[in-house]
Interface confidence: low
């Protein structure tokens, strides 16, 4: 249904709240570097423009895209080329390219000052002050350091964020009702972060088909109830929202997903059982409820799936006829019967699949060739069963902490040429599947921890990609997309890596990691960790344990210590020696 | 987009008789198997009957066997279920669904058999 003004139509659908704080997600997800003021600016000025619009559908302008509009607004900042190099060179360009253009200078580690919490009093003074602008600048910091952040999903966290300081700065102990609460908000959106930039990931390097097949798996099993042509039409639409977030469509993608949502909620009968609940919430939450709800029970008596695609005659000509929807069925009616498998297994089984028919139906008797397929999937299944049993053993043995240290190590060797910042923050996260999937039951372990998994290894790819120094990455991540985690799974120790040069500078300590918060103090050991991995990756086990545990002592004596800084300067060259020493440096 | 649209249903006397057909589109129907699935109120699908991609090979379940017959037109993409002798327990909403499938599409149609 065409309009003769898309900026109006999109002002009207979303009313001018969600309007503005989509524009200035929009705006700082672009141009990561412009000051919270001139963002505001812009935005108004945009507003200002699509209410002229909607007054008048036919005035100025009023007809133009909103790339073109939003494109022509960001050519507008006069520090473009001495801010952001040659992002500049975008406004050279015509639609569609000058967005395109924008989308690749998206940057997933812009050099931006880490966010530091101000004091509760101080926070809700500024949220008392001017809540609307404490409010925008909190939607401006999220959407620059992540310019793949789902912008409806950030609404909701917004309107969380609202909602914390509104109880909190009222309450008698503000910190203990308000700290808590942002401490979640930030991890809960540091994971949303990420999940969604494997989904953008996944549409912009390895296409649609690849997004439809997660997708097709993913709803099958948590509507296995719904019809297969229910599955494909939400499969459709799924896609539809998501590319156009990623492609920086934020206002069309907003819209789109209220109304999946709303036909979600009118035809739940077909669809799952579960949604009844976040059915009757208020849009962003109810969106939110749909994209988090559990997994429907699977419908009693589900057919044996080797009629169909085994047994049947018709295997190879059904396949013939229309590859991607057999293929499509073969992995809904797959994926609704395996709830405990994860989403990227699932789509191997049906990937091995393909290949077999493709290889089979060509051959002179069809059925003969490809009657064995099932038993193929049988290693499939067992590797990353196998893995994560003793992955969550490890993980029971050395706790959160010492099993992430286990990974620095493990991931430092394998692509020892990654950079140090990086390698902590993807092993750290790495580490946390054993809390975040270790307690659940076999049936819902792997689906948490391979899934899990590929978003974190998604991390590392997109942060290696920005800046590549290891083929063996760049491989792993660009080979597959289901297979990523089989990959650097499957890597050894680098055995053409030359060890870094000993650099004392790298292990000198001083006083001030005395005041940081454990988490920040276990960062400073793990970086340290793989800097001793780099400088010596035939290191055993034993004597990297060793090194720590004296690095663990010297740290907790000298914080003790009255003249801290003369103790961290003393101690700590002869730690240095000492592993030194140990480890034959 | 795959889609299957129902039609036919409707209120009829027991002994009676109803033709439904089933539309559909987004997909190569010749290449495919198709079901009829039931619900009646209250109680979970129920499989009716199913036809091969090519319309030879044809299955019922016991409740519906001798009195319904599946059949399929691949020219117009539409799948049909003549049903006879209508009896008050056959009172559902009817779905076509691909392949042997027991789960229930989108909107159906409802059969109601009563006097």
């Known amino acids: 249904d065409a309009h003769k003004s898309e900026v109006a139509h999109r002002f009207k659908d979303l009313g001018e709240e969600n309007f503005k704080a989509l524009v200035l997600i929009a705006f700082a997800q672009y141009l990561q570097q412009c000051p919270f003021e001139d963002h505001v600016k812009l935005v108004n000025e945009v507003t200002e423009f699509a209410k002229t619009c909607v007054a008048d559908e036919s005035a100025e302008n009023c007809d133009k895209s909103l790339h073109t509009l939003f494109g022509d607004k960001l050519c507008t900042v006069a520090t473009l080329r001495e801010t952001y190099g040659e992002m500049a060179d975008c406004c050279a360009k015509q639609e569609p390219e000058r967005n395109e253009c924008f989308l690749q200078h998206k940057d997933d580690n812009p050099n931006l000052p880490r966010l530091v919490r101000p004091e509760v009093d101080v926070m809700c003074t500024a949220f008392h002050d001017n809540e609307e602008t404490f409010l925008k600048k909190y939607l401006y910091e999220i959407a620059r350091r992540h310019p793949y952040f789902y912008a409806p999903e950030l609404l909701f966290f917004a309107k969380r964020y609202k909602a914390a300081f509104t109880e909190c700065c009222q309450a008698a102990d503000k910190a203990a009702c308000l700290l808590p609460k942002l401490d979640e908000l930030r991890d809960e959106g540091k994971a949303s972060s990420a999940k969604q930039r494997l989904k953008c990931a996944s549409l912009q390097k390895f296409g649609e088909r690849a997004f439809k097949a997660w997708a097709v798996a993913r709803l099958s099993q948590r509507f296995p109830k719904a019809e297969f042509a229910e599955v494909s039409k939400l499969v459709t639409d799924l896609t539809k929202v998501h590319t156009e977030c990623c492609h920086g469509d934020l206002l069309e993608c907003a819209d789109d997903r209220a109304d999946l949502a709303k036909y979600i909620c009118e035809n739940q009968d077909s669809i799952s059982s579960k949604l009844k609940e976040c059915c009757e919430k208020p849009l962003l939450e109810k969106s939110h409820c749909i994209a988090e709800v559990e997994n429907d029970e699977m419908p009693a008596d589900l057919p044996s799936l080797a009629a169909d695609f085994v047994e049947s005659k018709d295997v190879c000509k059904n396949y013939a006829e229309a590859k991607d929807v057999f293929l499509g069925m073969f992995l809904y009616e797959y994926a609704r019967r395996h709830p405990d498998y994860s989403v990227v297994l699932l789509l191997r089984l049906a990937k091995t699949y393909e290949t077999t028919l493709e290889k089979c139906c060509a051959a002179a008797d069809p059925h003969e060739c490809y009657a064995k397929v099932f038993d193929e999937f049988k290693p499939l299944v067992e590797e990353p069963q196998n893995l994560i049993k003793q992955n969550c053993e490890l993980f029971e043995q050395l706790g959160e902490y010492k099993f992430q240290n286990a990974l620095l190590v493990r991931y430092t060797k394998k692509v020892p040429q990654v950079s140090t910042p990086t390698l902590v923050e993807v092993s750290r996260n790495l580490g946390k599947v054993g809390s975040k999937c270790c307690k659940h039951p076999e049936a819902k372990r792997m689906p948490c921890a391979e899934d899990y998994l590929s978003v974190v290894l998604n991390q590392l790819c997109v942060l290696h990609e920005k800046t590549p120094v290891s083929d063996r990455v760049t491989k792993c991540c660009t080979e597959s997309l289901v297979n990523r985690r089989p990959c650097f799974s499957a890597l050894e120790v680098d055995e053409t890596y030359v060890p870094k040069e000993f650099n004392a500078e790298t292990f000198t300590f001083h006083a001030d990691i005395c005041t940081l918060s454990e988490k920040e103090r276990q960062i400073k050991k793990q970086t340290a960790l793989v800097e001793l991995v780099k400088h010596k990756p035939k290191a055993t086990k034993e004597q990297l344990k060793a090194v720590m545990d004296d690095f663990a002592a010297f740290v907790e004596k000298c914080c003790k210590a009255d003249d801290k800084e003369t103790c961290f300067a003393e101690e700590g060259k002869k730690l240095v020696a000492a592993s030194q020493a140990a480890l034959g440096l | 987009e795959v889609q299957l649209l129902e039609s036919g249903g409707g209120l009829v006397q027991p002994g009676g008789s109803l033709r439904l057909s089933c539309a559909a589109s987004?997909?190569?129907?010749?290449?495919?198997?198709m079901s009829w699935v039931r619900q009646a109120p209250g109680k979970g699908p129920e499989w009716v009957s199913a036809?091969?991609?090519?319309?030879?090979?044809?299955r019922y379940a016991e409740t519906v066997k001798g009195r319904f017959t599946i059949s399929r037109d691949n020219s117009k993409n539409t799948l049909y279920l003549q049903m006879n002798s209508l009896r008050p327990e056959d009172t559902a909403v009817y779905y076509c669904t691909i392949g042997r499938s027991t789960s229930r599409g989108s909107q159906g149609t409802l059969v109601t058999v009563s006097s």
């Open positions: 036809i091969d991609s090519g319309g030879a090979d044809t």
């Open positions: 987004g997909f190569t129907f010749g290449s495919f198997g």
